[in-house]
Every structure is written in C-alpha cells, then in structure tokens.
C-alpha cells in the first residue's frame, strides 16, 4: 500500500539538492581560501540534520545551530550590503565591489541561495514533491527558518555604515514583511551601527522622482531612528550607469548624479 504523503502548497525540494549543497560548499572553499578549514561533508550532514525526519512546519532556529557553528565566518562588519526585492543587482554590485558582501556572498547564504528543501516527519526522505508555503501552509518551514536565522546573524554582525538596496519599482519600496523589514532591520545593533544608508533603485528610464520621500521609506526611517541609528537615503536613478561607475569610477560621466 503506498504511504500517504502530505501535500504542501509550495514547490518541492530542488532536484539534486544534496549534490548541489555539497558542490557549492566545495566551490566556495575553492573560491575563498580563508574558508578551507570547513569540512564540506560535515556541513552537508549538519544541513541535512536540521530538517530530515522533522515535521516541515515545526522547524526551529535551534535545528540550524550545528550548521551555523560550522559555517561561522567573519566578514568585514562595515562592508555589509543588505537588499530587499532586488537581489540580482545587489549581487552584480558585490561582484564588482569585491570588498562588500551580501548574505549570499557568505558560505551559508551561497549554499542555500535559490534552493528549496524539506523533509518528512519520522522518515529520512527528502520531499521532492512539495514543501510548505510560508503563507498558505506555515512560517516555521525549513527554508523560512533558515533564512530568518542567517539573516538575523548577518544583521547582528554589521557595524558602522550599513547599506541596503531597495527596489524603487515596487509598490512598497520598504516592506515590513520582507526579510529585511521583519528580521534584519530589527537586528542591527545600535551600539555598533551608526547609519543605515538606503539606496533606492529606480526602474524607469525617465523616473526622476525623489523616491527617498516615499511613505514606506519614511516608515523605514522612523523605525531606524527609534532604534537610535541614523538613516540616510540615496536615489539611484540609473542602475546600469551605477554599476558601470562602480567598475570605472574614473569615467568622466561618473561625477554627475547616477
């Protein structure tokens, strides 16, 4: 008799998930020699241990602690770039500006970026059919808890001036329900972080509005100010030119507003 399997609303575990995590770990340690002490097989075992045989709606941050310990990494605390709903541009930026780091430039973020995973209670199987959706099923699912855990730790580590890239094309430029709005903002440490500087990325070619005046940005400013952290905001009117000027800052066209 075929065993009954829970059907969740979200997509199932990414195919080749174990192979992908292990391969990414090996790649990361090749690319970042300072992380060569990491044993990738142990990392995979800890990752697997966080969700295998556990109910995928009952995952806790505690489940991920062995993985967090193995993936402990020091990034320059004053070179952190947070982002919300504009991941690709943030990653393009840190690819050029090599001394700045998004969460996905760290080992743990790199391992899990764009992947989905979950297990099943009391079986050692990975569920490739479906996984819980944050809204429709439950918030304490393996993927959401992982990102909440690593995002919190990343924000807690930040110091001095922290930058955040925000998507000016969205109706809510700052969204309180995003990982940035619900986790990272609240875990910046006022005793370490002096300023949060928001970069609002414009989508339209002819969009010359000052999106730093947007009501949601004002809401972000209010939250940050209440936490005794200074806030500043810049419009990035031309993201393509912005990246080009990061690559070639001496270009004569890079002195004007981007």
């Amino acid at each position: 008799v075929p065993r009954w399997r829970q059907q969740w609303s979200g997509p199932g575990t990414t195919k080749r998930f174990p192979e992908t995590v292990l391969a990414r770990c090996v790649k990361y340690t090749e690319i970042h020699p300072e992380m060569r002490h990491v044993d990738c097989q142990s990392v995979w075992d800890a990752f697997k241990g966080a969700f295998i045989s556990k109910h995928p709606c009952n995952i806790t941050e505690e489940d991920y602690q062995p993985l967090m310990k193995l993936g402990t990494q020091t990034v320059p605390c004053n070179k952190i770039l947070l982002w919300s709903r504009i991941k690709d541009l943030a990653h393009q930026f840190t690819q050029v500006q090599r001394d700045m780091f998004t969460l996905e430039d760290t080992l743990l973020g790199y391992l899990a970026d764009d992947l989905t995973w979950c297990g099943e209670f009391n079986t050692s199987k990975i569920n490739y059919q479906s996984c819980p959706d944050w809204r429709k099923d439950c918030s304490n699912n393996p993927v959401s808890v992982f990102w909440k855990t690593v995002s919190r730790r990343f924000a807690e580590a930040a110091c001095d001036v922290v930058h955040v890239m925000l998507n000016g094309s969205r109706s809510k430029i700052f969204d309180k329900n995003s990982t940035f709005g619900s986790v990272e903002v609240h875990n910046l440490q006022p005793e370490k972080v002096q300023t949060l500087e928001a970069w609002v990325i414009h989508g339209g070619r002819e969009d010359s509005r000052d999106l730093c005046q947007d009501p949601t940005i004002k809401e972000l400013e209010s939250i940050i100010s209440k936490r005794n952290i200074q806030f500043s905001c810049k419009n990035i009117y031309r993201p393509d030119k912005f990246l080009q000027c990061v690559k070639n800052p001496e270009d004569s066209s890079c002195t004007s507003e981007i």
């Epitope: 080749r16 391969a23 990414r24 090996v26 020699p33 060569r36 990653h91």
Partner: antibody, heavy 120, light 107 residues
C-alpha cells in the same frame, strides 16, 4: 567520465581578440569552478582566472585584468576565455582546468589546450 | 602574490635512481601544494595534492612531503616514462602560482 574539450588552434593579428571555448561533459557544469591557465612556448604555467558557472562570478589575475573576460553558457555546458588587444607575447597554449572532489584544490581535469599564435 | 621557487630547473638521472625536486614558497601555504607532470604537447597531469596525497591511479614511486614553506617531490625509482617537466603549484591563496618547472631527463 569527466571531459574538457577545447576549441581548435587560432592565429590572430596583433590588436585582435580571441575567444577560446571549453565544453565539458561527464559532470554537472555548475557544480565546479572552471579555471584558465596560460603556458608560453617552452615555459611555465600561469593561472589566469576562474568562473563559477552557476552564478557567473569571476576572478581574474591582476596581470590579465582589463584584457581577459571569462564567461560560461550553462545551456551548452561551455566555458569561454576571451583575450583582447592581442600582442605577440600572448602567443601561448591556453588550458581550462578544474578541481575534483578527491584532489584537495589541485586540478585533476584539464582540457587538451588551445594554441594561440599572435603574428602580423 | 606568493612566489614558488622550484629547484633544480633541470636534472639528469639514471633509470632506478631516486629523484628529488624542491619547492619553496615565499610565505606559508600550509599544505596546499600540488605537483604536476607535463609531457611535451600534453596538458599537465596531477600527481600529488595537498603536499603528500597521491592522486587516484598515480604510481606509488611518486611521493610528496612538506608544509608551510618547504616542499619536496620524490620519484623513488626513476622510470623511462617519467621523462617530463614537473611543476609545483600553491593552491592556498589567489592567485594560484606555479613553480618554474623541473625538466627530468634520463642519463
């Protein structure tokens, strides 16, 4: 069986650009970093740079920055190394190479090499 | 960049001889040194990784040792098919750097 097959020999004029390909098989292309290595005739080996095909991230040795572009096409499992503003001293054999799971960070897998001759 | 100084640049030995090549790194590279064999017109072939580990299928006459800055590669009993150029490479820090090579010939 892991295989890295490179494009054929090229003869170019000074100032031109050459683009060498490295098509892989026998493993998942995005699972490994691809490296490029230069070897002048009768001389030693020099690491040029790498690409992570999964994310398109690259790193190029300082000596080659500004002239070398490394790219990857995941739809065809092919890595590319483009060298621009060619000069006679770029005459060399160019290899693609990658690490393996049981080889530390050494390169057990190499392409057969592509000879580039720069001559007017 | 880390310099890898390899010596000798060439050597001539008889079949059955013990052959030793050294590589000195300009700074500590832990045990992240690999040794390659290259025959004319061919791609390099990995023999030793992480200073002392023989890669799969490599004959036991090839060995490596060392850590930090001083590394040694040994062929315990030279065979005719070992005629080649041998290179060390440090894989500890970007950019990876190679030694200048040692050409091994038979007397």
């Amino acid at each position: 069986e892991v295989q890295l097959v490179q494009s054929g020999a090229e003869v170019k004029k000074p100032g031109a650009t050459v683009k060498i390909s490295c098509k892989v098989s026998g493993y998942t292309f995005t699972d490994s970093v691809m490296n490029w290595v230069q070897q002048h005739p009768g001389k030693g080996l020099e690491w040029m740079g790498w690409i992570d095909p999964e994310y398109g991230r690259t790193d190029v040795a300082e000596k080659f920055q500004g002239r070398v572009t490394i790219t990857a096409d995941t739809s065809t499992d092919t890595a590319y190394m483009e060298l621009s503003s060619l000069r006679s001293e770029d005459t060399a054999v160019y290899y693609c190479a990658r690490t393996g799971y049981q080889s530390g960070y050494g390169f057990p897998y190499w392409g057969q090499g592509t000879t580039v001759t720069v001559s007017s | 960049d880390i310099q890898m100084t390899q010596s000798p640049s060439s050597l001539s030995a008889s079949v059955g001889d013990r052959v030793t090549i050294t590589c000195k790194a300009s700074q500590n590279v832990d045990s992240d040194v690999d040794w390659y064999q290259q025959k004319p017109g061919k791609a390099p072939k990995l023999l030793i990784y992480k200073a002392s580990n023989r890669y799969t299928g490599v004959p036991s006459r090839f060995s490596g040792s060392g850590s930090g800055t001083d590394f040694t590669f040994t062929i315990s009993s030279l065979q005719p098919e070992d005629i080649a150029t041998y290179y060390c490479m440090q894989s500890n820090t970007h950019p990876r750097t190679f030694g200048g090579g040692t050409k091994v010939e038979i007397k």
